[in-house]
């Protein structure tokens, strides 16, 4: 779930079941004020989709999405 | 508090090579994926190399083969081996824990003959 919008959105629940890759478009870390920290990635249908970033998953799409820009 | 210290950085000459050292504290430092980023003055910041929590990693096309990224989970830090260093590597090298956008103070690698 986020609170807000994009720049200064929160995760307070995490997905729990991985994404799959190609239906994921861009991401956004959520802002260092949050109580826990928090990927947000955008989905290709633009649903903003709250990933724990302690799960290899997230760690790996993350670095794809920054190498490939 | 999140806190990262890099360090490592210096003069060199092309085709040398540097190790930089980053050392994390305030997270959970096991559990998170690292970069290396860099920023060149007037551009962005920009990843260079990362490792997963399992230690999978990941490098830009620009460094493969001559960077390698490792970490040390016991002493709370991540490296960045550069080897056969050019003067495009040139730039301040940051480190920072994927989902916890912290930023250190970063450290000068300069490469030039």
């Known amino acids: 779930s986020l609170a807000a919008d994009t720049p200064t959105a929160c995760c307070f629940s995490y997905t729990s079941r991985q994404i799959p890759q190609n239906f994921i478009a861009d991401y956004f870390e959520t802002s260092s004020q949050c109580s826990k920290p928090g990927v947000i990635f955008l989905t290709k249908r633009s649903r903003q989709v709250c990933a724990d970033p302690s799960e290899e998953w997230v760690q790996k799409y993350v670095s794809d999405l920054e190498l490939s820009a | 508090e999140v806190q990262l210290v890099e360090s490592g950085g210096g003069l060199v000459q092309p085709g040398g090579s540097l190790r930089l050292s980053c050392v994390a504290s305030?997270?959970?430092?096991?559990?998170?994926?690292l970069g290396w980023y860099r920023q060149v003055p007037g551009g962005q910041r920009e990843l260079v190399a990362s490792i997963t929590s399992g230690g999978s990693t990941n490098y830009a096309e620009s460094v493969k083969g001559r960077f390698t990224i490792s970490r040390d989970n016991f002493k709370n830090t991540v490296y960045l081996q550069m080897d056969n260093l050019k003067p495009e590597d040139t730039a301040v090298y940051y480190c920072?824990?994927?989902?916890?956008?912290?930023w250190g103070q970063g450290t000068q690698v300069t490469v030039s003959s």
């Open positions: 305030g997270i959970n430092f096991s559990r998170y994926g």
């Open positions: 920072s824990a994927i989902g916890w956008r912290y």
